[in-house]
């Protein structure tokens, strides 16, 4: 058993049929010595008396808010949550496996630049009685500070018969060094509590591996005289690290016909312009990637050819 | 060429070669690393590779003030990785396919380090730890880790030379 926060405790249980459970001793936070009784949640049934209460925690029915009273007055509370371990593996019932980039990916994170700011998100089908708490650091043995905000519900979508809820959090490394080569990964820890179930999820990454630039901005076409060719130009996204002579991007320019089956013409360039042939009803799209490190491409910025 | 005395390197040549290094490092190991390394013992692996750290002067301001600190750090790293790529970790079993980009990568690391430090001048170089894996599969693990960290190292080096070529070239 360990303390999650003041008056909230997590009991770690091996979860299998007829498991013996864990013996837990609760102590009433009071100078009083006698006349103390204990109840669980809203029940008025007295579970025991005395300054300590010993309970055998085996299932969710044994978890909840234990309260000690004296003469009708509440002295203190202890909330017990359960953390299940099945076949040596901690349960992951609350969050959905996003399966990208690999199985057992519950947290996904992205950064728009090298500033040390990043966003993580996760999915669940649970809509109520759900709380999240996020902590982060750079490295684990001698951790350096990363400050995370509160997790918020960022999207709701319908998947078949189910509703899916996306939560996200923004974090910022306290003393980020954008130009340095990271040697210690960022660690992100999410505590999830649904009713009386506790679970924790972790992710470890280098900022360089989660970079995904915003799409190029100000995408424009300039027809070339007496030619089917056009000059496409664009700019670095505002959110990208500066100076651009140091934090350089590379670009992919694509000409795509109306039909998805039509052959796509692609050009790769380090410049912020390119000359392409504009077919009727086609569109021109440009996306960006770090020039020197193969992290994710941005989403496409597009303009129609006409 | 960057010499210990402090003259300027051939920024544009360094920029071209460092960008080639980035391409080679990614073609040698294109995965972004979704291999399951957790089940493999890490005892035989190393984290002692040189990193370009915050105080090494490789940021745009540091380069403007005095690029020598940064260039020396890059040179140290290039020599370190060049030795690693020529070591038993990469020459031992399982042997690399004949068309593996590691050979070119090895030669380019040497080429860039020579551009930075001509014959007759010597910057200190970092000792490479003697890593001779007792199991062939551990070489795979070390290759993986070395190439992943080399990708990060050459990315910073390429940024330095690109910025130098754009803003510090005579």
């Amino acid at each position: 058993i360990w303390e999650l926060k003041k008056d909230v405790y997590v009991v770690e249980l091996d979860w299998y049929p007829d498991a013996p459970g864990e013996m837990v001793v609760l102590t009433c936070d009071t100078p009083e010595e006698d006349g103390i009784t204990w109840t669980l949640d809203q029940s008025s049934e007295v579970l025991g008396s005395g300054k300590t209460l010993t309970i055998q925690v085996k299932e969710f029915g044994d978890a909840g808010q234990y309260t000690c009273h004296k003469g009708g007055e509440v002295l203190s509370h202890s909330l017990l949550l359960l953390h299940k371990k099945e076949d040596g593996i901690w349960s992951t019932d609350i969050l959905k496996d996003q399966k990208e980039p690999k199985n057992k990916t519950f947290l996904r994170c992205e950064a728009k630049n090298y500033s040390g700011r990043f966003t993580c998100w996760w999915l669940t089908t649970i809509s109520t009685d759900l709380t999240f708490s996020v902590k982060s650091s750079r490295g684990s043995s001698d951790p350096q500070g990363v400050t995370c905000g509160a997790a918020t519900l960022s999207a709701e979508r319908v998947r078949g018969d189910n509703k899916e809820y996306e939560y996200s959090v923004e974090c910022q490394e306290d003393s980020a060094c954008p130009a340095a080569e990271e040697s210690l990964p960022i660690e992100v820890m999410v505590d999830a509590v649904h009713k009386l179930k506790y679970e924790n999820y972790t992710s470890s990454f280098f900022i360089r591996d989660i970079i995904k630039p915003d799409p190029p901005k100000n995408l424009q076409l300039k027809p070339l005289k007496n030619s089917r060719q056009v000059e496409v130009s664009w700019e670095y996204p505002d959110t990208w690290s500066t100076p651009h002579s140091y934090f350089s991007l590379t670009f992919c320019v694509q000409v795509q016909g109306k039909s998805k089956r039509e052959k796509k013409d692609r050009v790769f360039t380090d410049k912020t312009s390119a000359t392409v042939i504009c077919r009727k009803n086609a569109s021109i799209s440009v996306r960006a990637q770090d020039r020197y490190y193969s992290s994710s491409w941005s989403e496409w910025a597009s303009v129609p050819c006409s | 060429r960057a010499v210990p005395g402090g003259s300027s390197p051939a920024w544009t040549q360094c920029q071209q070669l460092s960008q080639k290094l980035c391409t080679l490092a990614w073609s040698a190991h294109p995965l972004v690393g979704h291999m399951d390394l957790r089940e493999e013992g890490d005892e035989e692996t190393t984290n002692d590779v040189p990193h370009i750290q915050c105080g090494d002067g490789c940021d745009p301001q540091g380069l403007r003030d005095n690029s020598q600190f940064c260039l020396q750090r890059i040179h140290q790293g290039l020599i370190f990785y060049e030795k690693l790529l020529g070591s038993d970790i990469f020459t031992g079993e399982p042997s690399l396919l004949p068309d593996s980009p590691v050979g070119q990568l090895h030669a380019s690391l040497l080429g860039l380090s020579q551009l930075l430090q001509p014959e007759g001048h010597h910057w200190e170089t970092q000792q490479i730890p003697s890593l001779s894996p007792s199991q062939p599969w551990q070489r795979l693990l070390l290759r993986f880790k070395i190439l992943r960290s080399l990708q990060a190292f050459v990315a910073v080096a390429a940024r330095v030379f690109a910025h130098g070529a754009a803003t510090l070239s005579p």
Partner: antibody
Framework: QVQLVQSGAEVKKPGSSVKVSCKAS????????ITWVRQAPGQGLEWMGE????????YYNEKFKGRVTITADKSTSTAYMELSSLRSEDTAVYYC???????????????????WGQGTLVTVSS | DIVMTQSPDSLAVSLGERATINCKAS???????????LHWYQQKPGQPPKLIYN??KLESGVPDRFSGSGSGTDFTLTISSLQAEDVAVYYC?????????FGGGTKVEIK
């Protein structure tokens, strides 16, 4: 075509040594390893060790506690396996095999004992 | 050392029937969670062994009635339709860790 030709059968006294040769032809000797495997009469296969002439690496089965020495002569494309302090339980057919052990930088991992010698029967008897 | 345990020791199967040979390692013989360092060899009487399955790949020239599967510690070689020429002893071999080790062998005969 690829061939591995082993030296002839040997009868040895306990305590003595035997050196079996394996001459390779039909391929570039240094591009592959040579593995030694033995098989006692009516028994299974036992890996003894292997040598890679190009890298100079040799791997041994510690079970033989220094009794086995595997070498290669690149000039004649011949591999050798010497086993010392012979005992009766060393009576076996000794095979050499060409070992191809390659990978892309980190995986996949290809290991094949793809060509074998005809085997050399070593009998240890007093 | 990694111990390779094969089962059964021998197997009698009718012509055209399926033969299944198991090999269990005392420790994982996959690398990075996916690449297999487990191989299958066939040995006919009086001959040296012959490689038939390499990791997860059937050797060229080996009939496709042979198939290999498994990962981690448990592996299987299946002959989907046994032919007379498949009568032999089959060995698994791990080369994840030195010393490389063979299983004890499974003798396949015709019933």
């Amino acid at each position: 075509q690829v061939q591995l030709v082993q030296s002839g059968a040997e009868v040895k006294k306990p305590g003595s040594s035997v050196k079996v040769s394996c001459k390779a032809s039909g391929y570039t000797f240094t591009s592959y390893g040579i593995t030694w495997v033995r098989q006692a009469p009516g028994q299974g296969l036992e890996w003894m060790g292997e040598d890679y002439p190009r890298s100079g690496n040799t791997y041994y089965n510690e079970k033989f506690k220094g009794r086995v020495t595997i070498t290669a002569d690149k000039s004649t494309s011949t591999a050798y396996m010497e086993l010392s302090s012979l005992r009766s339980e060393d009576t076996a057919v000794y095979y050499c095999a060409r070992a191809e052990f390659i990978s892309t930088v980190v995986a996949p991992y290809y290991y094949a004992l793809d060509y074998w010698g005809q085997g050399t029967l070593v009998t240890v008897s007093s | 050392d990694i111990v390779m345990t094969q089962s059964p020791d021998s197997l009698a199967v009718s012509l055209g029937e399926r033969a299944t040979i198991n090999c269990k390692a005392s420790k994982k013989v996959t690398i990075f969670g996916s690449t297999s360092a487990l191989h299958w060899y066939q040995q006919k009487p009086g001959q040296p062994p012959k490689l038939i399955y390499n990791g997860a790949k059937l050797e060229s020239g080996v009939p496709d009635r042979f198939s290999g599967s498994g990962s981690g510690t448990d592996f299987t070689l299946t002959i989907s339709s046994l032919q007379a020429e498949d009568v032999a002893v089959y060995y698994c071999l791990q080369n994840k860790e030195v010393p490389y080790t063979f299983g004890g062998g499974t003798k396949v005969e015709i019933k």
